[in-house]
Structure formats: C-alpha cells, structure tokens
C-alpha cells in the first residue's frame, strides 16, 4: 500500500439551486479544522440523498470547493465557510476541484502543492504525442519493407 498514487485534477463550475432541503451537502476543513494534511481547504464530506447536489449529480464526496459565488474559500475558518454557504442565496455557483485516482493504491487527498496531483492535460498531451510518433515510425518502417 506504499505505491505512489497519482491524480487527474480537473476543475468545474457547478451551479446549484437551493432545494426544499437546502443545498444538500456537508463540508469539512478550514484553517482551524484541517481535515486534509497540509491543506486548510474546504472539502465535501457528505452528499445528502435526494438533495440539490445529489440530484444535480456533479458534486462528489471528496471534492475540494475553491469558491462560492466567486468568493475564494482560501484561509477561512471552518464556521466562516459554513456561514458563506448558508448565506449564499437561492442560486449558488461553486468552483470545484475533482481529483480522480489514476493508479491503484490507498484512496486519499493530497495537500496543496503536492507534485502528485497532476492536471489532466499534462497526462494526455504526452500520451497523444507518443502515439503520433509511434504511428509515424510504424509507417516509415512499413515503407522501407
């Protein structure tokens, strides 16, 4: 269980409408409640069944919420972050960071600045380039036969 765990990191803008049971998710984190080591960011800890977030389907447990209605969530006390969500109004815009594990190993989150959180384009671009080079080399080889 000690193998390196890499992540594809993607960001998404999620617009939620506060439903009859609210936004329908819980959060952890903050400068006074670091839930992820070396990271005081705000993370989704639970999504309520049939709540607004669950019905929308895009927000996932473990997602990091970067901003609410354009307001950055960096360096906030936990309760201040909670109050921000509770007072965000009827239409709520969330900037969210998803992290998808791309290699077998223990599931977890990396802190900010951890080099193993790899943006998706940094994985896909080299793969695409290698594929193109291999195809070109194969065609040249066939021509020489």
């Amino acid at each position: 269980m000690n193998g390196r765990v890499d992540y594809l990191v993607t960001e998404e803008e999620i617009n939620l409408t506060r439903g009859p049971s609210g936004l329908g998710f819980n959060i952890v984190g903050g400068t006074d409640q670091q839930y992820v080591s070396n990271d005081s960011g705000i993370y989704v800890s639970r999504i309520k069944e049939n709540g607004a977030a669950a019905l929308d389907g895009r927000l996932q447990e473990g997602d990091k919420i970067l901003s609410v209605n354009g307001q950055d969530l960096k360096n906030l006390l936990h309760q201040d972050a909670v109050d921000l969500f509770r007072n965000a109004g009827y239409a709520v815009s969330l900037r969210v960071q998803h992290r998808l594990q791309v290699q077998n190993g223990p599931i977890g989150h990396r802190g900010e600045g951890d080099p193993s959180g790899i943006p998706i384009f940094m994985v896909l671009v080299p793969v695409f380039a290698l594929t193109m080079v291999a195809a070109w080399a194969f065609m040249r080889y066939r021509q020489q036969l």
Epitope: R18, P20, S21, G22, L23, G24, F25, N26, I27, V28, D32, Q33, Y35, V44, S45, R46, K48, E49, N50, H78, Q79, V82, F85, R86
Partner: nanobody
C-alpha cells in the same frame, strides 16, 4: 465509524429538568456535527437540536427553543442536551445522531436523512 450511547433519560414531572448525555467512540469526534432527535410512539423521528464541530454553531426545533440547550465536550467525546421546563408533549425516545462535517444548510431543513450514525435511544417520560 462512530458508536453512540445515550444516557440520562427517565421519568420526570412536568416543569422539571433532565440532562441527556451521548458518549461517542471513534476517531475525529470533533469533525462531526452532533444532533438530538426524538420519536414519540407512532410518529416520525423529529429533529430537536444540533451542534457544530466546535460548539459555536447550534440549531433548535421551534418547539424546544428557550427550553433545551445542546452542548458538547470534544475532550470527552460527549454531547449533552439540557432539557428544562419539560412538558408532557416532550415524552419520547431521544436519539443521539452524528454526521461527518457541517451541513451547508440551516437547521430549519434538518431531518433524520441528514445523519448517518445513531444511538439506541433513551426514554424520556414527562407526567
């Protein structure tokens, strides 16, 4: 995984007081929102009160505001419900509940679906 054990229930006369306790076992107790619910015979389990991770944020059902007070001691992994001016309609089984993190909605919205872990309940009877 959190295990919850309630205590402090009993029989009390109208106008009297009781203090319920809920002892939690498991890691990171302070990261949990804790709540109290109650269920009278034949009725749904209703929200009573909840308290945020640090104790700074609390919410109450309208029916108990001004009479009940929820508190927690993270060093003891325990949450309390002080019940004063009890009425016969407060008779019910009282359940302690826990959920990881803080709900992003006010407690006006709270239902039993918002909590994942439950105690076995303690009976409160007001005569």
């Amino acid at each position: 995984q959190v295990q919850l054990v309630e205590s402090g229930g009993g029989l009390v006369q109208a106008g009297g007081s009781l203090r319920l306790s809920c002892a939690a076992s498991g890691p990171t107790f302070s990261s949990y929102t804790m709540g109290w619910f109650r269920q009278a015979p034949g009725l749904e389990r209703d929200f009573v009160a909840e308290i945020g991770w640090s104790g700074g944020s609390t919410g109450y059902a309208d029916s108990v505001k001004g009479r009940f007070t929820i508190s927690r001691d993270n060093a003891k992994n325990t949450v309390y419900l002080q019940m004063n001016s009890l009425k016969p309609q407060d008779t019910a089984v009282y359940y302690c509940a826990a959920v990881i993190g803080s709900p992003t909605d006010y407690s006006d919205y709270r239902s039993s679906l918002d909590y994942d872990y439950w105690g076995q309940g303690t009976q409160v009877t007001v005569s």
